[in-house]
């Protein structure tokens, strides 16, 4: 089974702008269940030197708190280092700038490292469009539909848009 | 484009050991997570252990205390080194550059059996 893995065409900046999280998925069912560390909702990106800026969305206390990250760039031209709960390798494996974004971590957090997949999309009514790419790179990287959470609005922070 | 290639497999009693090796080429091999999985005859192909870029590392419950995962950033290599195999442990072993997760390799055959 071979393949290319997608990079964004363009350039990063074409990442930019706000994105809606659809669905995660996880080997630690911790990480992605409510108050899990990784039960994060994207708001936004921005690519500045070839590094991403993102704001997420976390739920904390019934209301939902805004954080900006920085995954910066590496040798590796799919791969940024983030800091977040520990350091994670943060991979893009498929990307649509103008419809939806793939990516996935191995989060180092003390002694622990796992791995966490994120679907986001532009457009939410969308969002079944892309679950099978989805389905597909968490098939490859070794995470099974059962470990995928679809997350409803309710989920995801709506509320707590601009 | 990236290539693995997967050694060191083979026949095995239980309660044996076995070290897997994988050559990465085509990657920045210090730079990138790596991993190996395994696929037994009619199941899904699962996850064993992974490495970070960083050596952290994490095995599946079932192999825990048994099955160790390892880098040589120098040689381009990743290692699993199994002890106590059990029959259940047969399978196709695959390792995984995180960077390219659509590439496999042609995988190493690991069989316990009396």
């Known amino acids: 089974q071979e393949g290319n893995h997608e990079e964004p065409q363009g350039g990063l900046e074409e990442l930019s702008g706000r994105w809606h999280s659809v669905a995660l998925a996880s080997n630690k069912s911790d990480l992605i269940k409510p108050w899990g560390h990784f039960r994060v909702f994207i708001h936004s990106m921005s690519a500045k030197d070839g590094n991403l800026h993102g704001d997420i969305l976390i739920p904390q206390d019934g209301q939902c708190e805004k954080v900006s990250l920085t995954a910066f760039k590496t040798a590796t031209s799919n791969k940024f280092d983030l800091e977040y709960w520990g350091h994670n390798d943060l991979y893009l494996a498929e990307v649509d700038p103008k419809s939806y974004l793939i990516l996935y971590m191995i989060n180092q957090y003390n002694d622990d490292t796992s791995l966490v997949a994120h679907l986001m999309v532009r457009d939410l009514s969308r969002q079944q469009d892309f679950l099978p790419a989805f389905e597909s790179v968490c098939e490859d990287i070794g995470l099974h539909k059962d470990q995928i959470v679809v997350l409803s609005d309710d989920d995801r922070c709506q509320g707590s848009r601009d | 484009e990236v290539q693995l290639v997967e050694s060191g497999g083979g026949l095995v009693q239980p309660g044996g050991s076995l070290r897997l090796s994988c050559v990465v080429s085509?990657?920045?091999?210090?730079?990138?997570?790596m991993g190996w999985y395994r696929q037994a005859p009619g199941k899904q192909r699962e996850m064993v252990a992974i490495i970070s870029s960083v050596g952290t590392t994490n095995n599946v419950d079932s192999v825990n205390g048994r099955f160790t995962i390892s880098r040589d950033n120098a040689k381009n290599t990743v290692y699993l080194q199994m002890n106590s195999l059990k029959p259940e442990d047969t399978a196709v072993y695959y390792c995984?550059?995180?960077?390219?997760?659509?590439?496999w390799g042609q995988g190493t055959q690991v069989t316990v059996s009396s």
């Open positions: 995984k550059d995180f960077s390219a997760p659509r590439y």
């Open positions: 085509g990657s920045i091999f210090s730079d990138n997570a």
